[in-house]
């Protein structure tokens, strides 16, 4: 399986909400012996590889933001802890999973990574990740809504607040 990032760049005004999204692609085994651990963290374009460094998102670590389930089950994080920080990560039945960040500030700008770990009985982990950039802007040059740039092309789309 692979992880796709529909958008590689999100440009948002301060105070807006945004939902960063990753999508699980390829054959996903729904057997009882396969589970998926999904999480989010901030990173940098490191020397080893992008997303190899793990930094907290608003003081929440990747452990705090993880999702766990088998196959394409829906899941979400521990609501209380995440929501106190204006965050919520969630996953649907179609392989999409996301993190929503509310009331963006300039400090939220940076590189965000989603990580998926496939856990299969009697086998090694298989981990894949996706990366996307969030730019939070303020002032007269800031967009009125978030503008997202698809990973496959330079065309941009306006999206309304999450």
């Amino acid at each position: 399986f692979k992880v796709a990032t529909p958008y590689s760049l999100y440009v948002c005004p301060e105070g807006q909400n945004v939902t960063l999204t990753c999508r699980l692609l390829g054959p996903v085994d729904k057997g009882h012996d396969v589970t998926f651990y999904k999480t989010w963290y901030r990173s940098s374009r490191g020397e080893v590889q992008t997303c190899s460094e793990r930094r907290p998102i608003r003081n929440l670590t990747f452990q705090d933001l993880h999702l766990h389930h088998g196959g394409h089950q829906a899941a979400n994080t521990s609501h209380d802890l995440a929501q106190r920080h204006g965050l919520e990560s969630a996953s649907d039945h179609h392989g999409n999973f996301s993190i929503t960040m509310r009331n963006l500030t300039l400090l939220d700008s940076g590189l965000y990574c989603c990580l998926v770990v496939e856990i299969r009985a009697a086998a090694s982990e298989h981990r894949v990740h996706g990366a996307m950039e969030l730019q939070v802007q303020t002032g007269k040059d800031a967009p009125s809504n978030c503008v997202v740039y698809p990973s496959s092309s330079q065309d941009s789309e306006n999206i309304t607040a999450a």
Partner: antibody
């Protein structure tokens, strides 16, 4: 704060089965690997195996024929059974939480098990 | 299974000195390598994961580097509490394996 506590007999006779339990307190047993690791006196660490919260297991091939790890999520416990023990199985046995794509981040204090008649 | 070889077996240094510990894998483990510290009578404590990420609460004097087969744990300036045994561990392949350990002792 998640804490782990091993419990079980400290002395086991050769050819018998070693049985240990690890109790997880202060957090959920869901979404992690729960591992057993051992350390013979004066030696290094050896991973025995894990159980994932969903019930999937993975054992060290060197011990696979003798090891069973099980989980009781309702009691927040997981257990180790090692059959046909010999003196070579004398070690400190640790239980540990292992987060996927991460590491063993929380360990029990360890329990010494001596195999002797 | 992947064999991890640590060197030296013992490192004799004084407080304030720099310690450099090596871990070599029998095949590539990418950057999926962790370092642990163990003091006598205690369980190991996680220091570094994914070769260079410091675990929560670990002082900045501990740093990890390397990828593939060669890894290094560096303690920039040894504190009295740093004298212990250090283990590396890989998680790219099962079974998970540990190195034989490096003992950092007071000179």
């Amino acid at each position: 704060q998640v804490q782990l506590q091993e419990s079980g007999p400290g002395l086991v006779k050769p050819s018998e089965t070693l049985s240990l339990t690890c109790t997880v307190s202060g957090g959920s047993i869901s979404s992690y690997y729960w591992s057993w690791i051992r350390q013979p006196p004066g030696k290094g660490l050896e991973w025995i195996g894990y159980i994932y919260y969903s019930g999937s297991t993975n054992y060290n091939p060197s011990l696979k024929s003798r090891v069973t790890i099980s989980v009781d999520t309702s009691k927040s416990q997981f257990s180790l059974k090692l059959s046909s023990v010999t003196a070579a199985d004398t070690a400190v046995y640790y239980c540990a939480r292992d987060i996927p794509a991460f590491a063993f981040d929380i360990w029990g204090q360890g329990t010494m098990v001596i195999v002797s008649s | 299974e992947i064999v991890l070889t640590q060197s030296p077996a013992t490192l004799s240094l004084s407080p304030g000195e720099r310690a450099t510990l090596s871990c070599r894998a029998s095949q590539s483990v990418s950057y999926y390598l962790a370092w642990y510290q163990q003091k006598p009578g205690q369980a190991p404590r996680l220091l570094i994961y994914d070769a260079f990420n410091r675990a929560t609460g670990i002082p900045a004097r501990f740093s990890g580097s390397g990828s593939g087969t060669d890894f290094t744990l560096t303690i920039s300036s040894l504190e009295p509490e740093d004298f212990a045994v250090y283990y590396c561990q890989q998680r790219i392949n099962w079974p998970l394996t540990f190195g034989g350990g490096t003992k950092v002792e007071i000179k």
